[in-house]
């Protein structure tokens, strides 16, 4: 719809209008992750709960095999939060010895796979250095934005280290999208 | 609306359509918090400005007594940011003495209260360890996601420590929701 | 539309309805920033990519000279993420010498400029202290909320230090808005 122009908003528009409740929507929530193979040089993808608790998919938006499947072309708002937690990061120990170092980091990427491009497209990235001294640490990374997606596109959430993801509560780590 | 299926999107849909401007919406902004009693083991709820400055409620979305009241069932996007600020956290002093410790933390929870359900439901949580050494610190936690809400549901924002909330500016700490 | 009341949602509404694809929308992505003069006591504004890669503007939402131009009045969801990166912050060195100090900080502000109003309005602010010891650091600040905007309003993103903005990837630093 990128360049599409409709009648000015003060005019009457009769068709083809949408009932808002008919729009594809999904909110997925975290589950315990099972270790899986992932491609070299590609962060592992999270899998999700899609029907229990707060999670749902509706109006032809389906979840399968770590992917949200986009059922119709349009502009979608896509969001995710991943809460990470870990022990003291390695860099802080090196740091204490007085040697500056590239810090450990945590990263979340919302990725689109499309039939017309041989590589995944990174839609959103949140990346943060972690240099904590002498303690357990935890923190969320939140992402959200609007994208023009095509029918058949697939969305997934990749993380730098699946073992650091807090999977204990559905409100801490989640992933969603809805057609605008 | 979870399992509801409408006519395919290529068909004409005539009713019952909504004028978008008719949808319940609210954006609330921070005010200075008055100390109040809160239940043990439950984070205190923030109260909010609902009509001055950037704040507004419209189309039957009302704010009362720390709660946003959901006037009709549907899928809502709900969001909040809370900016925290404080002095050096306790854990950092312990840490300096060489004793690792569970760090201080800051937490925001967006909570749903349903009359027909005894326990509040935590919709969204942002929680972060805070281990700052020798300085004042400040940082925001942002949350946002889509939820299926019912008419009569109430939403509130709870925080781990109300005294750490930055109430100085309406753009730093806020809470909102809108029907999709 | 603030106080406007429509027919209850269970009634049929025939006009003036909108085709959703007709609504003003934009997603802008980061580009390398050219140093520019900015007013003293005012954070510099970022400029943006508006048509290449993931970036787009549509339905009369235009981007010009660091501003998103609002083409019609209504409620908009406005969002931005800025990823910052830098070397060890100054405060940490002072800190190591045992002198507590107001830490370095990073700040993002989404600002509204209205021709009829002399002062820009800060819609959203994300501000964070940065006190890293002995390392490079990087981290995002995300903001998003709903605002009632008027035709002709202009939106921009201001940052505390343009030299710390990570402009390397379109998924790390972005700015968008869409009419609800």
């Amino acid at each position: 719809l990128k360049g599409q122009e409709f009648a000015p908003s003060h005019q009457q528009v009769y068709a083809p209008l949408r009932a808002d409740g008919d729009k594809p929507r999904a909110h997925l929530t975290v589950v315990r992750q099972t270790p899986t193979q992932h491609l070299k040089n590609q962060f592992p993808a999270l899998h999700w709960e899609h029907e229990l608790g707060l999670a749902f998919t509706k109006n032809r938006m389906n979840y399968t095999n770590k992917f949200l499947l986009i059922p119709e072309s349009g502009d979608y708002f896509v969001y995710s939060q991943v809460t990470f937690r870990g022990m003291t990061s390695e860099c802080s120990e090196i740091r204490q010895a007085g040697r500056p170092n590239k810090p450990d980091s945590i990263t979340v990427v919302i990725t689109k796979v499309t039939d017309s491009y041989p590589e995944p497209t990174q839609l959103l990235m949140g990346t943060k250095s972690v240099c904590e001294v002498g303690s357990n640490w935890f923190q969320p990374i939140y992402l959200g934005a609007m994208f023009s997606l095509q029918e058949g596109d697939k969305l997934m959430v990749n993380v730098s280290d699946i073992s650091l993801v807090d999977y204990t509560k559905e409100d801490k780590t989640f992933f969603g999208a809805f057609l605008l | 609306l979870k399992g509801q299926e409408f006519a395919p999107s290529h068909q004409q849909v005539y009713a019952p359509l909504r004028a978008d401007g008719d949808k319940p919406r609210a954006h609330l902004t921070v005010v200075r918090q008055t100390p109040t009693q809160h239940l043990k083991n439950q984070f205190p709820a923030l109260h909010w400005e609902h009509e001055l400055g950037l704040a507004f409620t419209k189309n039957r979305m009302n704010y009362t007594n720390k709660f946003l009241l959901i006037p009709e069932s549907g899928d809502y996007f709900v969001y909040s940011q809370v900016t925290f600020r404080g002095m050096t956290s306790e854990c950092s002093e312990i840490r300096q003495a060489g004793r690792p410790n569970k760090p201080d933390s800051i937490t925001v929870v967006i909570t749903k209260v349903t009359d027909s359900y005894p326990e509040p439901t935590q919709l969204l949580m942002g929680t972060k360890s805070v281990c700052e050494v020798g300085s004042n610190w400040f940082q925001p936690i942002y949350l946002g996601a889509m939820f299926s809400l019912q008419e009569g549901d109430k939403l509130m924002v709870n925080v781990s420590d109300i005294s750490l909330v930055d109430y100085t500016k309406e753009d730093k700490t806020f809470f909102g929701a809108f029907l999709l | 539309l603030k106080g406007q009341e429509f027919a209850p949602s269970h009634q049929q509404v025939y006009a003036p309805l909108r085709a959703d694809g007709d609504k003003p929308r934009a997603h802008l992505t980061v580009v390398r920033q050219t140093p520019t003069q900015h007013l003293k006591n005012q954070f510099p504004a970022l400029h943006w990519e508006h048509e290449l890669g993931l970036a787009f503007t549509k339905n009369r939402m235009n981007y010009t000279n660091k501003f998103l131009l609002i083409p019609e009045s209504g409620d908009y969801f406005v969002y931005s993420q800025v990823t910052f990166r830098g070397m060890t912050s100054e405060c940490s060195e002072i800190r190591q010498a045992g002198r507590p100090n107001k830490p370095d900080s990073i700040t993002v502000v989404i600002t509204k400029v209205t021709d009829s109003y002399p002062e820009p309005t800060q819609l959203l602010m994300g501000t964070k202290s940065v006190c890293e010891v002995g390392s490079n650091w990087f981290q995002p600040i995300y903001l998003g909320a709903m605002f009632s905007l008027q035709e002709g309003d202009k939106l921009m993103v201001n940052v505390s230090d343009i030299s710390l903005v990570d402009y390397t990837k379109e998924d790390k630093t972005f700015f968008g808005a869409f009419l609800l």
């Epitope: 491609l39 389906n62 399968t64 095999n65 992917f67 499947l69 059922p71 796979v113 499309t114 039939d115 017309s116 491009y117 041989p118 590589e119 995944p120 029918e151 058949g152 697939k154 | - | -």
Partner: antibody
Framework: QVQLQESGPGLVRPSQTLSLTCTVS????????MHWVRQRPGRGLEWMGR????????KYNPSLKSRVTITRDTSKNQVSLRLSSVTAADTAVYYC?????????WGQGSLVTVSS | DIQMTQSPSSLSASVGDRVTITCRAS?????MYWYQQKPGKAPKLLIY???NLASGVPSRFSGSGSGTDFTFTISSLQPEDIATYYC?????????FGQGTKVEIK
């Protein structure tokens, strides 16, 4: 090892239905998209359609849409092509192609002749 | 349909020569793909997204262009480059290929 292998009858009678199967190995089909492309003798390449195996979404070349069907069986790691009401003009090498999220890969092709 | 017009339809060049093939789309596309097909073999992806070299493809191959006009270049033709080269757009439905350029050695 990643492989795409087309299989099916090499000869189909006019007005009958051409059926081909692509069996994949070495990758998860659900992570990708599977296409069918054909090349008629001495001619260029023609895209026929694709399926998104995880959800089953299909797209077809409008010039073939009334005759072509692409399906998948993820349990067998197979994608199938059916082309109905064939004529001699459908004689071609038919390729199964993987795209999306992973490097493009083509099968070696299957020659199908339409003749009575 | 978006029509892809490829030129020339064939060319003959010497080993070491720079070879250029152009592809024009009937309407603007974001991405262009270039394939190499040797006789009796399946096509092989060389360039995606107009200018990205596919994995394992020699650096003498390159692509450029945007909108409607795209160019594919072999900087120094080698004997093993004898093949037919196709451009393809993946945006409109249907996805369409150019008619091909046959490259031969003089």
């Amino acid at each position: 090892q990643v492989q795409l292998q087309e299989s099916g009858p090499g000869l189909v009678r006019p007005s009958q239905t051409l059926s081909l199967t692509c069996t994949v190995s070495g990758f998860d089909m659900a992570d990708t998209y599977m296409h069918w492309v054909r090349q008629r003798p001495g001619r260029g390449l023609e895209w026929m359609g694709r399926i998104e195996p995880a959800g089953g979404h299909t797209k077809y070349n409008p010039s073939l849409k009334s005759r072509v069907t692409i399906t998948r069986d993820t349990s067998k790691n197979q994608v199938s092509l059916r082309l109905s009401s064939v004529t001699a003009a459908d004689t071609a090498v038919y390729y199964c192609v993987r795209s999306g999220g992973l490097p493009d890969m083509w099968g070696q092709g299957s020659l199908v002749t339409v003749s009575s | 349909d978006i029509q892809m017009t490829q030129s020339p339809s064939s060319l003959s060049a010497s080993v070491g020569d720079r070879v250029t093939i152009t592809c024009r789309a009937s309407s603007s596309v974001s991405y262009m793909y270039w394939y190499q097909q040797k006789p009796g073999k399946a096509p092989k992806l060389l360039i995606y997204g107009a200018s990205n070299l596919a994995s394992g493809v020699p650096s003498r191959f390159s692509g450029s262009g945007s909108g409607t006009d795209f160019t594919f270049t072999i900087s120094s033709l080698q004997p093993e480059d004898i093949a037919t080269y196709y451009c393809q757009q993946w945006e409109g439905n249907p996805r369409t290929f150019g008619q091909g350029t046959k490259v031969e050695i003089k």
